[in-house]
C-alpha cells in the first residue's frame, strides 16, 4: 500500500568519507514538487541528516551547509553524503514525499547500510 522508495542495501564509503547511492521512488505521474529527506537510524532513534525540496524540472539542491548533495532525474535521486567518519557507519533511510500538487504521498526506503572505514594514519617516515 502506498508509495515505496528503493535504495541499495549496502554502500561502502570512500577513503575520503564520501558515499553515494540512488534512491528511486514509484512515481504517481503528476508530482511537480518532491521532498527528499535522508534519515539515519541508530537503534530506535531516527535523526535527519539532510533534506531538500526540488521541482521535477530542476536539479536537486541541498542547503549550503548541508552534508549532502544530490541530483535528480525523473523518479530517481542520486544522493551523496560527505564528511563521513567511522562513527557515521549506520543505516541511512531515504524518505521521499510527493508534496505538490495533491495528493500527498510518502515512501520510505528500507535503508542503505553505509560502512565507513577511517583511513589508517600514514606512518612517519624517517
Amino acid at each position: 500500500k502506498g508509495m515505496h522508495a528503493a535504495q541499495p542495501a549496502v554502500v561502502l564509503a570512500s577513503s575520503r568519507g564520501v558515499a553515494s547511492f540512488v534512491c528511486e521512488y514509484g512515481s504517481s505521474g503528476n508530482a511537480a514538487e518532491v521532498r527528499v529527506t535522508m534519515l539515519r537510524q541508530a537503534g530506535s532513534q531516527m535523526t535527519e541528516v539532510c533534506a531538500a525540496t526540488y521541482t521535477v524540472e530542476d536539479e536537486l539542491a541541498f542547503l549550503d551547509d548541508s552534508t549532502c548533495t544530490g541530483t535528480s532525474s525523473g523518479n530517481k535521486v542520486n544522493l551523496t553524503i560527505q564528511g563521513l567518519r567511522a562513527m557515521g557507519t549506520g543505516l541511512y533511510i531515504c524518505k521521499v514525499e510527493l508534496m505538490y500538487p495533491p495528493p500527498y504521498y510518502v515512501g520510505m526506503g528500507n535503508g542503505t547500510q553505509i560502512y565507513v572505514i577511517d583511513p589508517e594514519p600514514c606512518p612517519d617516515s624517517d
Epitope: K1, A32, A51, T53, E97, M99, P101, P102, Y105
Partner: antibody
Framework: EVQLVETGGDLMKPGGSLRLSCVAS????????MSWVRQAPEKGLQLVAG????????YYTDAVKGRFTISRDNAKNTLYLQMNSLRDEDTAVYYC???????WGQGTLVTVSS | QPVLTQPPSVSAALGQRVTISCTGT?????????VQWYQQFPGRPPKTIIY???NRPSGVPDRFSASTSGTTATLTISGLQAEDEANYYC???????????FGSGTQLTIL
Amino acid sequence: EVQLVETGGDLMKPGGSLRLSCVASGFTFSSYSMSWVRQAPEKGLQLVAGINSGGSSTYYTDAVKGRFTISRDNAKNTLYLQMNSLRDEDTAVYYCVISNWSYWGQGTLVTVSS
Amino acid sequence: QPVLTQPPSVSAALGQRVTISCTGTATNVGGGYDVQWYQQFPGRPPKTIIYGNYNRPSGVPDRFSASTSGTTATLTISGLQAEDEANYYCSSWDNSLTAYVFGSGTQLTIL
C-alpha cells in the same frame, strides 16, 4: 519548534471579503508547499487550497474556485488566503497546514452571516 | 456529507486496545491513496498522528498504529491512556472528486 499562527478571522456579511494570514516559524518555510484546511461544524474538514513552495502553482477545491486566492511571501514566512464573495457556507475555522500534514496552526474563525 | 465512513463513537477501558475503522471506496482508500489520521481535542486544532498509511510523526507514541486493507483503513490504539480520549478523523485523496475527503470523526471514550 514549528509554529503556524493564523490571523484575520472575523464576522462578515455574505458577499464580503477577508484576508487570512499565517506566519510560519521554526522551519524553512520556503521549502514547503502549504495548504489551508477548514473545519465547519456540519461539513467537517475540507482542504480548501494549496500552493507550492515557490508560490508559482496553486490548487483549489471546487467549492472556492474563482472566489478564494492562496498566495505566499517567502521573504516574510507568510501564507495568505484572500476570500472574496463570502457565503454562509464558508463559515468555519481555517487552519494553515504544511502540505505533508505534519503541522497545523491553531486556526482562525471566519463567520459569514447576515 | 463526509465520503469516508467512521463509527460516531467507540469506547474501551484504560489499558485496553481499540480500533477505529475508516471505510471508503475504490476511488480513495481502495485506490492506493495514502491515508492520514488526526487526533483532535475540543477547542484545539487537529494533530496528525499517522501519515502515509502507517507512519508516525516524531513524538507520537508507538501505541498508535494504522493499516489499510482494501477500502478500509484502521487506526489501532493499544494500552489506552486517559489522555487518548479525543476525536479521531481519517482522510484520503479521492480520484473521482479530485479532492481530499475526510471522515466525520470518531469520539473515543475511555471507560
